[in-house]
Amino acid sequence: MMTGTIETTGNISAEKGGSIILQCHLSSTTAQVTQVNWEQQDQLLAICNADLGWHISPSFKDRVAPGPGLGLTLQSLTVNDTGEYFCIYHTYPDGTYTGRIFLEVLESSVAEHGARFQIP
């Protein structure tokens, strides 16, 4: 039985040209995390495998950095980066948990003058 829950940063916004950290946290389970996949829509951004470490998709190497922790840092943001991001936790013995984050990338002036979500 899957008892765990994924906590995410939820809906976030960031300035065009800036960076953002995508974070998920799995709680309420003793299951072992074997791998975390990060996806944007259906595209793989990165994998963090418990045994093998990080794999950053070659398509995103120029704009993605691993961490902190099991999170992922997106850099040099563009308006096209707006959309859904998913953290997919592969665990044993529970199975797969998925968290969703919605990122809105705003033009600099918009972000400065009243972004809907604050970036820590």
Partner: antibody, heavy 117, light 113 residues
């Protein structure tokens, strides 16, 4: 020990398709990418694409897009590469290779595909 | 696509002498996050698949003799065989795995002088 064992040589006519298999053993199949690389007679190495057996991810060289399909069967730890609309220039040795983040460390023995009318 | 340019095309070296093969990339292969260059070197003998020698530009693969070494960062790389042995006669390829599509150099044929 890590092994990638490929299917045997194939002779095909132009316009046909070929499906080459690569059976993995000696490691956790779903953890590593499998890449396909080909080598025409007397020529260098050409990357065709990759597939991640642990998920639905694959990436193809634009040169082969629309003609190549990579699939996997986790129950048998086997990856397949199918190339369609074959032409004489596709005559080559086709290799599968294992990859994570630090290059292709184990290679299959190669499968010779000959396209001839 | 990233173009990998190898030089020389062929090289003849005497037993026990040093062999040097160069590889130049059309784009930077250094990933800022881990400060590693995504460049590998392979050895291929006739009728055999390529064999990984060096990855991340300078890390020797397990079981590879220490006479093989890799150096360089960013766009310029070198494979050095410090003291050539008869079994080193082969074709050597560099490969970038920084970005899709992965690309190889045209190869350097190493022969005995």
């Amino acid at each position: 020990q890590v092994q990638l064992v490929q299917s045997g040589a194939e002779v095909k006519k132009p316009g046909a398709s070929v499906k080459v298999s690569c059976k993995a053993s000696g490691y956790t199949f779903t953890n590593y990418w499998i890449h396909w690389v080909r080598q025409a007679p007397g020529q260098g190495l050409e990357w065709m694409g990759d597939i991640y057996p642990g998920g639905r991810y694959s990436n193809y060289n634009e040169k082969f897009r629309g003609r190549v399909t990579m699939t996997r069967d986790t129950s048998t730890s086997t990856v397949y590469m199918e190339l369609s609309s074959l032409r004489s220039e596709d005559t080559a040795v086709y290799y599968c290779a294992r990859y994570y983040e630090s290059a292709m460390d184990f290679w299959g023995q190669g499968t010779t595909v000959t396209v001839s009318s | 696509d990233i173009v990998m340019t190898q030089s020389p095309d062929s090289l003849a070296v005497s037993l026990g002498e040093r062999a040097t093969i160069n590889c130049k990339s059309s784009q930077n292969l250094l990933y800022n996050s881990n400060q590693k260059s995504y460049l590998a070197w392979y050895q291929q003998k006739p009728g055999q698949p390529p064999k990984l020698l060096i990855y991340w530009a300078s890390t020797r693969e397990s079981g590879v003799p220490d006479r093989f070494s890799g150096s360089g960062s960013g766009t310029d790389f070198t494979l050095t065989i410090s003291s050539l042995q008869a079994e080193d006669v082969a074709v050597y390829y560099c490969q970038q795995y920084y970005n899709y599509p992965f690309t190889f150099g045209a190869g350097t044929k190493l022969e005995l002088k």
